[in-house]
Protein backbone atom coordinates (compact mmCIF):
# COMPACT_ATOMS: atom_id res chain seq x y z
CA UNK A 1 0.00 0.00 0.00
CA UNK A 2 1.22 3.51 -0.90
CA UNK A 3 0.70 5.90 2.04
CA UNK A 4 1.47 9.03 -0.01
CA UNK A 5 -2.10 10.38 -0.06
CA UNK A 6 -2.99 9.92 3.61
CA UNK A 7 -4.26 12.84 5.68
CA UNK A 8 -1.07 13.06 7.74
CA UNK A 9 -2.26 15.87 10.02
CA UNK A 10 -5.33 13.91 11.12
CA UNK A 11 -3.25 10.78 11.71
CA UNK A 12 -0.76 12.88 13.69
CA UNK A 13 -3.61 14.28 15.81
CA UNK A 14 -4.87 10.76 16.54
CA UNK A 15 -1.35 9.71 17.52
CA UNK A 16 -0.83 12.67 19.84
CA UNK A 17 -4.24 12.39 21.50
CA UNK A 18 -4.47 8.65 22.07
CA UNK A 19 -2.11 6.23 20.26
CA UNK A 20 0.99 7.67 21.96
CA UNK A 21 -0.58 7.12 25.40
CA UNK A 22 -1.36 3.48 24.58
CA UNK A 23 2.23 2.91 23.46
CA UNK A 24 3.48 4.40 26.75
CA UNK A 25 1.08 2.18 28.71
CA UNK A 26 2.35 -0.89 26.85
CA UNK A 27 5.95 0.06 27.67
CA UNK A 28 5.27 0.89 31.33
CA UNK A 29 7.95 -0.48 33.59
CA UNK A 30 10.55 -0.39 30.82
CA UNK A 31 13.42 2.11 30.86
CA UNK A 32 13.43 4.43 27.83
CA UNK A 33 17.13 3.65 27.33
CA UNK A 34 16.65 -0.10 27.38
CA UNK A 35 16.36 -0.53 23.60
CA UNK A 36 18.31 1.04 20.75
CA UNK A 37 16.33 2.36 17.80
CA UNK A 38 17.39 0.32 14.79
CA UNK A 39 14.44 1.04 12.48
CA UNK A 40 14.20 4.47 10.87
CA UNK A 41 12.10 6.27 8.25
CA UNK A 42 12.79 9.18 5.93
CA UNK A 43 9.39 10.80 5.34
CA UNK A 44 5.77 10.44 6.42
CA UNK A 45 4.67 7.83 3.85
CA UNK A 46 7.81 5.80 4.60
CA UNK A 47 7.17 6.12 8.35
CA UNK A 48 3.62 4.82 7.95
CA UNK A 49 4.91 1.92 5.85
CA UNK A 50 7.33 0.96 8.63
CA UNK A 51 4.72 1.54 11.35
CA UNK A 52 2.24 -0.71 9.54
CA UNK A 53 4.84 -3.42 9.08
CA UNK A 54 6.01 -3.43 12.70
CA UNK A 55 2.48 -3.17 14.10
CA UNK A 56 0.67 -5.78 12.04
CA UNK A 57 3.21 -8.23 10.65
CA UNK A 58 4.03 -11.05 13.10
CA UNK A 59 7.75 -11.40 13.75
CA UNK A 60 9.86 -14.08 15.40
CA UNK A 61 9.35 -13.69 19.13
CA UNK A 62 6.44 -11.28 18.84
CA UNK A 63 3.28 -12.47 17.11
CA UNK A 64 0.62 -10.61 19.05
CA UNK A 65 0.83 -6.81 18.65
CA UNK A 66 -2.16 -6.54 16.28
CA UNK A 67 -4.57 -7.16 19.17
CA UNK A 68 -3.17 -4.37 21.34
CA UNK A 69 -5.13 -1.15 21.80
CA UNK A 70 -2.49 1.01 20.08
CA UNK A 71 -2.62 -1.35 17.08
CA UNK A 72 -6.41 -1.22 16.83
CA UNK A 73 -6.27 2.57 16.92
CA UNK A 74 -3.49 2.67 14.34
CA UNK A 75 -5.53 0.45 12.06
CA UNK A 76 -8.59 2.67 12.50
CA UNK A 77 -6.61 5.84 11.74
CA UNK A 78 -5.14 4.35 8.57
CA UNK A 79 -8.54 3.03 7.45
CA UNK A 80 -10.19 6.41 7.91
CA UNK A 81 -7.51 8.78 6.63
CA UNK A 82 -5.61 6.77 4.00
CA UNK A 83 -7.58 6.51 0.73
CA UNK A 84 -8.29 2.91 -0.24
CA UNK A 85 -6.49 1.44 2.78
CA UNK A 86 -9.58 -0.25 4.22
CA UNK A 87 -10.12 -2.43 1.15
CA UNK A 88 -6.58 -3.78 1.47
CA UNK A 89 -7.51 -4.95 4.96
CA UNK A 90 -10.63 -6.99 4.15
CA UNK A 91 -8.77 -10.26 3.62
CA UNK A 92 -6.13 -9.40 6.21
CA UNK A 93 -8.85 -9.07 8.85
CA UNK A 94 -10.18 -12.54 8.03
CA UNK A 95 -6.67 -13.99 8.27
CA UNK A 96 -6.11 -12.28 11.62
CA UNK A 97 -9.38 -13.71 13.00
CA UNK A 98 -8.20 -17.20 12.02
CA UNK A 99 -4.77 -16.70 13.67
CA UNK A 100 -6.11 -15.35 16.97
CA UNK A 101 -2.71 -15.17 18.65
CA UNK A 102 -2.93 -14.77 22.41
CA UNK A 103 -1.77 -11.42 23.81
CA UNK A 104 1.66 -12.11 25.31
CA UNK A 105 4.12 -9.37 26.24
CA UNK A 106 7.61 -10.66 25.49
CA UNK A 107 10.91 -8.79 25.60
CA UNK A 108 10.92 -8.95 21.79
CA UNK A 109 7.50 -7.26 21.72
CA UNK A 110 8.72 -4.53 24.07
CA UNK A 111 11.67 -3.94 21.78
CA UNK A 112 9.35 -3.79 18.76
CA UNK A 113 7.03 -1.28 20.45
CA UNK A 114 10.07 0.80 21.40
CA UNK A 115 10.93 0.89 17.69
CA UNK A 116 7.33 1.93 16.96
CA UNK A 117 7.59 4.83 19.38
CA UNK A 118 10.65 6.03 17.50
CA UNK A 119 8.92 5.71 14.13
CA UNK A 120 5.89 7.65 15.38
CA UNK A 121 8.12 10.39 16.80
CA UNK A 122 9.85 10.63 13.44
CA UNK A 123 6.45 10.73 11.67
CA UNK A 124 5.56 13.76 13.79
CA UNK A 125 8.73 15.64 12.81
CA UNK A 126 8.81 15.25 9.01
CA UNK A 127 10.96 18.31 8.39
CA UNK A 128 13.89 17.11 10.48
CA UNK A 129 16.91 15.99 8.49
CA UNK A 130 17.53 12.23 8.69
CA UNK A 131 20.49 11.53 11.02
Amino acid sequence: YDFTNCDFEKIKAAYLSTISKDLITYMSGTKSTEFNNTVSCSNRPHCLTEIQSLTFNPTAGCASLAKEMFAMKTKAALAIWCPGYSETQINATQAMKKRRAAKVTTNKCLEQVSQLQGLWRRFNRPLLKQQ
Epitope: S17, T18, E87
Partner: antibody
Protein backbone atom coordinates in the same frame (compact mmCIF):
# COMPACT_ATOMS: atom_id res chain seq x y z
CA UNK B 1 -28.92 -8.05 17.01
CA UNK B 2 -27.24 -4.75 16.11
CA UNK B 3 -29.64 -1.83 16.48
CA UNK B 4 -29.43 1.95 16.15
CA UNK B 5 -32.31 3.80 17.79
CA UNK B 6 -32.64 7.47 16.89
CA UNK B 7 -34.42 10.20 18.84
CA UNK B 8 -37.76 11.57 17.67
CA UNK B 9 -38.71 14.09 15.02
CA UNK B 10 -38.18 17.81 15.65
CA UNK B 11 -39.79 21.09 14.62
CA UNK B 12 -37.38 24.00 15.05
CA UNK B 13 -37.19 27.71 14.25
CA UNK B 14 -34.80 29.14 11.65
CA UNK B 15 -31.51 30.16 13.25
CA UNK B 16 -31.95 27.73 16.13
CA UNK B 17 -30.06 24.49 16.76
CA UNK B 18 -31.12 20.87 17.06
CA UNK B 19 -29.43 17.98 18.82
CA UNK B 20 -30.34 14.40 18.01
CA UNK B 21 -29.20 11.10 19.42
CA UNK B 22 -28.48 7.61 18.16
CA UNK B 23 -28.36 4.82 20.75
CA UNK B 24 -26.42 1.72 19.73
CA UNK B 25 -27.03 -1.78 21.06
CA UNK B 26 -26.01 -5.32 20.21
CA UNK B 27 -22.37 -4.63 19.37
CA UNK B 28 -19.14 -3.17 20.77
CA UNK B 29 -19.60 0.58 20.39
CA UNK B 30 -15.90 1.43 20.01
CA UNK B 31 -15.38 -1.07 17.16
CA UNK B 32 -17.42 1.17 14.87
CA UNK B 33 -17.51 4.78 13.73
CA UNK B 34 -20.88 6.50 13.74
CA UNK B 35 -21.72 8.29 10.51
CA UNK B 36 -24.48 10.81 9.91
CA UNK B 37 -26.31 11.18 6.60
CA UNK B 38 -28.81 13.79 5.44
CA UNK B 39 -31.70 13.21 3.05
CA UNK B 40 -33.92 16.07 1.93
CA UNK B 41 -37.47 15.18 0.81
CA UNK B 42 -37.36 13.40 -2.55
CA UNK B 43 -33.59 13.84 -2.74
CA UNK B 44 -30.48 11.68 -2.45
CA UNK B 45 -28.14 10.91 0.43
CA UNK B 46 -25.48 13.34 1.68
CA UNK B 47 -22.70 12.38 4.10
CA UNK B 48 -22.40 14.86 6.99
CA UNK B 49 -19.54 13.41 8.98
CA UNK B 50 -18.41 10.72 11.36
CA UNK B 51 -17.48 10.32 15.02
CA UNK B 52 -14.92 7.63 15.84
CA UNK B 53 -15.33 6.56 19.49
CA UNK B 54 -12.13 4.47 19.43
CA UNK B 55 -10.09 7.58 18.60
CA UNK B 56 -12.38 10.11 20.32
CA UNK B 57 -12.37 12.26 17.21
CA UNK B 58 -14.60 13.35 14.36
CA UNK B 59 -14.36 14.27 10.70
CA UNK B 60 -16.75 16.38 8.66
CA UNK B 61 -17.97 17.09 5.17
CA UNK B 62 -16.79 20.67 4.45
CA UNK B 63 -20.40 21.60 3.65
CA UNK B 64 -21.30 21.04 7.32
CA UNK B 65 -18.06 22.04 9.06
CA UNK B 66 -18.70 24.68 11.68
CA UNK B 67 -22.42 23.91 11.87
CA UNK B 68 -22.43 20.19 12.70
CA UNK B 69 -20.91 18.88 15.91
CA UNK B 70 -20.58 15.12 16.37
CA UNK B 71 -19.98 13.62 19.80
CA UNK B 72 -20.58 10.39 21.68
CA UNK B 73 -21.06 9.13 25.22
CA UNK B 74 -19.25 5.80 25.39
CA UNK B 75 -20.76 4.94 28.77
CA UNK B 76 -24.27 4.87 27.27
CA UNK B 77 -23.28 3.78 23.72
CA UNK B 78 -24.94 6.89 22.33
CA UNK B 79 -23.81 9.16 19.50
CA UNK B 80 -25.04 12.72 19.07
CA UNK B 81 -25.26 15.24 16.27
CA UNK B 82 -25.92 18.92 16.89
CA UNK B 83 -26.74 21.12 13.91
CA UNK B 84 -26.76 24.88 14.45
CA UNK B 85 -27.87 27.99 12.56
CA UNK B 86 -30.67 26.07 10.90
CA UNK B 87 -32.33 27.19 7.66
CA UNK B 88 -35.14 25.72 5.57
CA UNK B 89 -32.43 23.83 3.62
CA UNK B 90 -31.84 21.75 6.74
CA UNK B 91 -35.37 20.35 6.70
CA UNK B 92 -34.58 16.70 6.09
CA UNK B 93 -34.41 13.20 7.51
CA UNK B 94 -31.13 12.50 9.29
CA UNK B 95 -29.75 8.98 9.63
CA UNK B 96 -27.02 7.56 11.80
CA UNK B 97 -25.16 4.53 10.45
CA UNK B 98 -22.35 2.47 11.92
CA UNK B 99 -19.19 1.52 10.05
CA UNK B 100 -16.42 -0.76 11.28
CA UNK B 101 -13.05 0.91 11.77
CA UNK B 102 -10.90 -2.19 12.28
CA UNK B 103 -12.94 -4.61 10.17
CA UNK B 104 -16.01 -4.60 7.87
CA UNK B 105 -15.47 -0.95 6.76
CA UNK B 106 -18.99 -0.50 5.45
CA UNK B 107 -22.24 1.11 6.69
CA UNK B 108 -24.02 -2.11 7.51
CA UNK B 109 -26.60 -0.89 10.05
CA UNK B 110 -28.70 2.27 9.97
CA UNK B 111 -31.00 4.07 12.38
CA UNK B 112 -34.65 4.55 11.48
CA UNK B 113 -34.09 8.23 10.71
CA UNK B 114 -35.10 11.44 12.49
CA UNK B 115 -37.07 14.10 10.66
CA UNK B 116 -36.19 17.75 11.24
CA UNK B 117 -38.52 20.49 10.02
CA UNK B 118 -37.23 24.06 10.08
CA UNK B 119 -40.11 26.49 10.04
CA UNK B 120 -41.14 29.77 11.63
CA UNK C 1 -14.54 15.25 -3.70
CA UNK C 2 -15.31 12.06 -5.59
CA UNK C 3 -18.51 12.35 -7.64
CA UNK C 4 -20.59 9.24 -8.33
CA UNK C 5 -22.96 9.40 -11.29
CA UNK C 6 -25.66 6.76 -11.58
CA UNK C 7 -27.52 5.84 -14.71
CA UNK C 8 -30.22 5.63 -15.71
CA UNK C 9 -32.01 7.97 -13.29
CA UNK C 10 -35.16 5.88 -13.71
CA UNK C 11 -35.55 2.33 -14.99
CA UNK C 12 -38.97 0.94 -15.89
CA UNK C 13 -39.16 -2.86 -15.88
CA UNK C 14 -41.60 -5.70 -15.49
CA UNK C 15 -41.17 -8.41 -12.83
CA UNK C 16 -39.02 -11.27 -14.12
CA UNK C 17 -36.77 -9.02 -16.20
CA UNK C 18 -33.07 -8.75 -15.35
CA UNK C 19 -31.51 -5.31 -15.03
CA UNK C 20 -28.13 -3.61 -14.68
CA UNK C 21 -27.65 -0.32 -12.81
CA UNK C 22 -24.52 1.73 -13.47
CA UNK C 23 -22.37 3.84 -11.15
CA UNK C 24 -19.45 5.85 -12.53
CA UNK C 25 -16.81 7.53 -10.33
CA UNK C 26 -15.06 10.79 -11.21
CA UNK C 27 -11.70 9.20 -10.37
CA UNK C 28 -10.43 5.65 -9.84
CA UNK C 29 -11.55 4.22 -6.48
CA UNK C 30 -10.42 0.60 -6.83
CA UNK C 31 -13.28 -1.52 -5.36
CA UNK C 32 -14.39 0.84 -2.58
CA UNK C 33 -17.99 0.98 -3.77
CA UNK C 34 -21.07 -0.28 -1.94
CA UNK C 35 -24.68 -0.55 -3.06
CA UNK C 36 -27.76 0.35 -1.01
CA UNK C 37 -31.48 -0.13 -1.55
CA UNK C 38 -33.91 2.39 -0.12
CA UNK C 39 -37.62 1.76 -0.11
CA UNK C 40 -40.07 4.62 0.39
CA UNK C 41 -39.98 5.99 3.98
CA UNK C 42 -37.35 3.47 5.02
CA UNK C 43 -33.64 3.59 5.88
CA UNK C 44 -31.08 2.51 3.29
CA UNK C 45 -30.16 -1.20 3.35
CA UNK C 46 -26.75 -2.54 2.36
CA UNK C 47 -26.91 -4.91 -0.63
CA UNK C 48 -23.33 -5.31 -1.88
CA UNK C 49 -20.02 -4.23 -0.35
CA UNK C 50 -16.66 -3.58 -1.99
CA UNK C 51 -18.08 -3.76 -5.52
CA UNK C 52 -18.92 -7.47 -5.58
CA UNK C 53 -19.05 -8.95 -2.06
CA UNK C 54 -22.41 -10.37 -1.05
CA UNK C 55 -24.14 -9.52 2.23
CA UNK C 56 -25.71 -12.07 4.56
CA UNK C 57 -29.51 -12.05 4.28
CA UNK C 58 -29.59 -10.34 0.88
CA UNK C 59 -31.21 -12.42 -1.92
CA UNK C 60 -28.72 -13.98 -4.34
CA UNK C 61 -30.40 -12.24 -7.28
CA UNK C 62 -28.42 -9.12 -6.31
CA UNK C 63 -24.81 -9.09 -7.51
CA UNK C 64 -22.20 -6.45 -8.19
CA UNK C 65 -19.15 -6.02 -10.37
CA UNK C 66 -16.58 -3.46 -11.46
CA UNK C 67 -13.43 -1.69 -10.30
CA UNK C 68 -11.66 1.58 -10.95
CA UNK C 69 -14.33 3.98 -12.17
CA UNK C 70 -17.14 1.78 -13.51
CA UNK C 71 -19.41 -0.29 -11.30
CA UNK C 72 -22.59 -2.29 -11.91
CA UNK C 73 -25.38 -3.64 -9.74
CA UNK C 74 -27.19 -6.55 -11.37
CA UNK C 75 -30.62 -7.76 -10.36
CA UNK C 76 -31.41 -11.15 -11.82
CA UNK C 77 -35.13 -11.52 -12.46
CA UNK C 78 -36.61 -8.52 -10.66
CA UNK C 79 -39.28 -9.25 -8.05
CA UNK C 80 -42.09 -6.92 -6.97
CA UNK C 81 -40.32 -6.09 -3.68
CA UNK C 82 -37.29 -4.76 -5.61
CA UNK C 83 -39.05 -1.63 -6.85
CA UNK C 84 -37.25 1.14 -4.94
CA UNK C 85 -34.29 3.51 -5.21
CA UNK C 86 -30.70 2.23 -5.42
CA UNK C 87 -27.63 4.21 -4.38
CA UNK C 88 -23.94 3.51 -4.81
CA UNK C 89 -21.51 4.91 -2.25
CA UNK C 90 -17.74 5.30 -2.16
CA UNK C 91 -15.63 4.91 0.97
CA UNK C 92 -12.31 5.21 -0.85
CA UNK C 93 -11.63 8.63 0.66
CA UNK C 94 -13.27 11.29 2.79
CA UNK C 95 -15.67 12.90 2.32
CA UNK C 96 -17.66 9.76 1.58
CA UNK C 97 -20.14 10.37 -1.21
CA UNK C 98 -23.27 8.74 -2.58
CA UNK C 99 -24.43 8.37 -6.14
CA UNK C 100 -27.33 10.31 -7.56
CA UNK C 101 -29.60 7.25 -7.30
CA UNK C 102 -31.51 5.05 -9.73
CA UNK C 103 -35.24 4.57 -9.27
CA UNK C 104 -36.47 1.13 -10.31
CA UNK C 105 -40.15 1.38 -11.17
CA UNK C 106 -42.88 -0.88 -12.48
CA UNK C 107 -43.44 -0.58 -16.22
Amino acid sequence: EEKLQQSGDDLVRPGAAVKMSCKASGYIFTDYAMHWVKQRPGQGLEWIGTFIPLLDTSDYNQNFKGRATLTADKSSNTAYMELSRLTSEDSAVYYCARMGVTHSYVMDAWGQGASVTVSS
Amino acid sequence: DIVLTQSPATLSVTPGESVSLSCRASQPISISVHWFQQKSNESPRLLIKFASQSISGIPSRFSGSGSGTDFTLNINRVESEDFSVYYCQQTFSLPYTFGTGTKLELK
